[in-house]
């Protein structure tokens, strides 16, 4: 008799794929544009990335460091009107893209939460949650919560408001902290909170260190749903050299949880390559005319247009990974098992019941390595086959779809492999 199928877990929309942050509308749209009406015109691009949610803003009225002139219910007229916002919501809904609104109050000021009048600000946030929930927003983000006194209790209250409206609504909190204990203390009183942090931001050194960080986090958070990013707002290129971007894309899309990216991560947008551009929000490179300040500074392969035409580009890799992440059960909600593969490597399996299984092997080092996959580390339910099919490599040159012998697996410097193999009873 065939074994019984494992019962599927309840899946919220943010469990099904990546979130895409647009913190600065002007930088994202460029060319002196930067309003909600213009963003509506970019929704097809977001659809092509197969992201599930757009984390937008902040876009509310905020006079720098002035609580009285900060109104979380009013859209800054520079960004548009409530009608523009409503139109964006409706269009996003038609494309199955959820909209998450950033309500970080003093986003133009020194302290995101103002240094005084905590209760006043917290009341403003409560009002805003209720108002925007009723206006059709799918969730909220608040950043820099390390600057918010009694953050845990406020987050619990805001979570109650958000979930009280509908279980299908999401609250994201962001912190600059990379300390696991601080992160856990924020999480423990807030079930279902999605927390973005700088926890992985110093993981670029070795495969062992990354493996240690990831497994510690997953062990500490237990059955909680996680999010994966390198920071609460910044670009991947703020933390990683270009040669590791593909590796991290592969990792973020295949770890158990919600991957969270900032606009430009999909093309390797790098402020350092654009003189005069702010590190936290460089202009998005749609094409070579997006950065006219210095003629010739932008080549086609740095842009959305150029990378869209190149199947070997970072953007093409992002789209493929995003597609796999949103449709494969083992990547959607499968179990995770990390195991030893040799120094410099980080490897893990994702599997769900009798569905197709995935093996990820990541070489963080700058030398080629043979992988010594230690299958003995794995439970019986996640055993390795002798061969697995190559779904994709982060480096060009490998023949996709070809079976690879796992005992003889060799990885190029900074290469990541995503392999698939069937369930075997």
């Amino acid at each position: 008799r065939a074994p019984r199928c494992r019962e599927l877990p309840a899946q919220k929309w943010w469990h099904t794929g990546a979130l895409y942050r647009i913190g600065d509308l002007q930088a994202f749209q460029g060319h002196g544009a930067g309003n909600l009406a213009g963003l509506k015109g970019r929704l097809d691009y977001l659809s092509s990335l197969k992201v599930k949610g757009l984390v937008l803003g902040p876009i509310h009225k905020n006079q720098k460091d002035d609580v009285a002139q900060t109104d979380l219910l009013q859209i800054d007229p520079n960004f548009g009107s409530k009608e523009d916002f409503d139109s964006l919501l409706q269009s996003a809904k038609k494309k199955s893209i959820r909209v998450i609104l950033d309500l970080t109050p003093n986003y133009r000021g020194e302290n995101s939460w103002f240094s005084t009048q905590v209760d006043t600000v917290a009341t403003k946030v409560k009002d805003a949650l209720e108002f925007w929930l009723q206006a059709g927003v799918d969730g909220f983000q608040v950043r820099d919560i390390e600057n918010l006194k009694d953050a845990s209790s406020f987050l619990a209250e805001w979570q109650n408001i958000t979930k009280g409206f509908s279980e299908d609504r999401l609250l994201i909190a962001g912190t600059n902290s990379s300390d696991l204990q601080q992160i856990l203390s924020l999480l423990e009183s807030n079930k279902d909170l999605l927390l973005t942090s700088s926890y992985l931001s110093d993981s670029g050194s070795t495969g062992e260190h990354t493996k240690s960080l990831v497994t510690q986090y997953l062990n500490a958070t237990g059955n909680r749903w996680c999010s994966w990013s390198l920071s609460q707002a910044r670009l991947l290129t703020s933390f990683l050299p270009a040669q590791l971007l593909r590796l991290y894309q592969l990792m973020l899309f295949t770890l158990p949880g919600t991957p969270v990216f900032s606009y430009g991560d999909e093309i390797g947008l790098d402020a350092a390559a654009l003189p005069g551009q702010p590190m936290e929000a460089p202009v998005m490179l749609w094409d070579e005319s997006s950065f006219p300040d210095i003629p010739g500074a932008v080549s086609a392969n740095m842009t959305v247009k150029g990378q869209s035409e190149d199947p070997g580009s970072l953007l093409s890799l992002f789209r493929r990974l995003s597609d796999q992440r949103s449709k494969e059960r083992s990547l959607l909600h499968g179990d995770f098992h990390a195991f030893s593969a040799g120094p410099g490597l980080f490897s893990y399996i994702r599997h769900w019941d009798q569905n197709e299984r995935f093996l990820v092997v990541l070489n963080f080092g700058d030398v080629g390595l043979s992988a010594g996959l230690q299958a003995s580390d794995l439970p019986a339910s996640a055993s390795l086959p002798a061969k697995a099919d190559l779904l994709l490599s982060t480096q060009p040159g490998r023949e996709e779809g070809s079976p690879l012998e796992l005992e003889r697996l060799k990885l190029e410097p900074h290469e990541g492999l995503l392999l698939r193999f069937p369930y075997a009873a």
Epitope: D86, T123, V125, A128, L133, Q134, F165
Partner: antibody, heavy 119, light 114 residues
Framework: QVQLQESGPGLVKPSETLSLTCTVS????????VHWIRQPPGKGLEWIGL???????NYNSALMSRVTISVDTSKNQFSLKLSSVTAADTAVYYC?????????????WGQGTLVTVSS | DIVMTQSPDSLAVSLGERATINCKSS????????????LTWYQQKPGQPPKLLIY???TRESGVPDRFSGSGSGTDFTLTISSLQAEDVAVYYC??????????FGQGTKVEIK
């Protein structure tokens, strides 16, 4: 118990500013918002605006250029100012509590105060 | 702005009989986010402020007699008084409290005893 009481001059001259106060008791101003509504004699209800617990305000766009709503938490009072009034602004003016989370329904109302605009 | 239209403008019903008031909105008042319908009913007796009867189209405010019930979804709504009492003589208003302001009222329906 929850109470709201409107007060202000019953007669205002055309082109002047109508000023009303709503004094509340029995609930916390940091937990509930307050609506202003008006009703011309023998007619229906018109929503003017809502001031939230945190001080944010939603206005009826038809009146927005003339209306100002504010709060003085130390006195448990809300105020409504309507400038450049005409005879069409003659009405009973009510304040009412926004009573429920995820709803703009008004669960407690003041008795209302009649304001007549006439020279 | 959402326009609310009530019918009839006035209604005369015998004591103990059913009274039905209709309200139509110019757009749907269903919030797909929480599947609630944002329609409120008020009762206003002569010389008094309005009184909240029903919110979310069908949720009775505490203390409101159960002879008052609200129904409907989308754009068409009904307030029913199952057995009219003398104290129910009043003007009844529906109000949209959906999404963005202004939160507009219907023109009112006057209920009298036949």
């Amino acid at each position: 118990q929850v109470q709201l009481q409107e007060s202000g001059p019953g007669l205002v001259k055309p082109s002047e500013t109508l000023s009303l106060t709503c004094t509340v008791s029995g609930f916390s101003l940091t937990s509930y918002g307050v609506h202003w509504i008006r009703q011309p004699p023998g007619k229906g209800l018109e929503w003017i605006g809502l001031i939230w617990a945190g001080g944010s305000i939603n206005y009826n766009s038809a009146l927005m250029s003339r209306v100002t709503i504010s709060v003085d938490t130390s006195k448990n009072q809300f105020s409504l100012k309507l400038s450049s009034v005409t005879a069409a602004d003659t009405a009973v003016y009510y304040c009412a509590r926004k009573g429920h989370m995820y709803s703009y329904a008004m669960d407690y109302w003041g008795q209302g105060t009649l304001v007549t605009v006439s020279s | 702005d959402i326009v609310m239209t009530q019918s009839p403008d006035s209604l005369a019903v015998s004591l103990g009989e059913r009274a039905t008031i209709n309200c139509k909105s110019s757009q749907s008042l269903l919030n797909s986010g929480n599947q609630k319908t944002y329609l409120t009913w008020y009762q206003q007796k002569p010389g008094q402020p309005p009184k909240l009867l029903i919110y979310w189209a069908s949720t009775r405010e505490s203390g409101v007699p159960d002879r008052f019930s609200g129904s409907g979804s989308g754009t068409d709504f009904t307030l029913t008084i199952s057995s009219l009492q003398a104290e129910d003589v009043a003007v009844y208003y529906c109000q949209n409290d959906y999404s963005y302001p202004p939160w507009t009222f219907g023109q009112g329906t006057k209920v009298e005893i036949k």
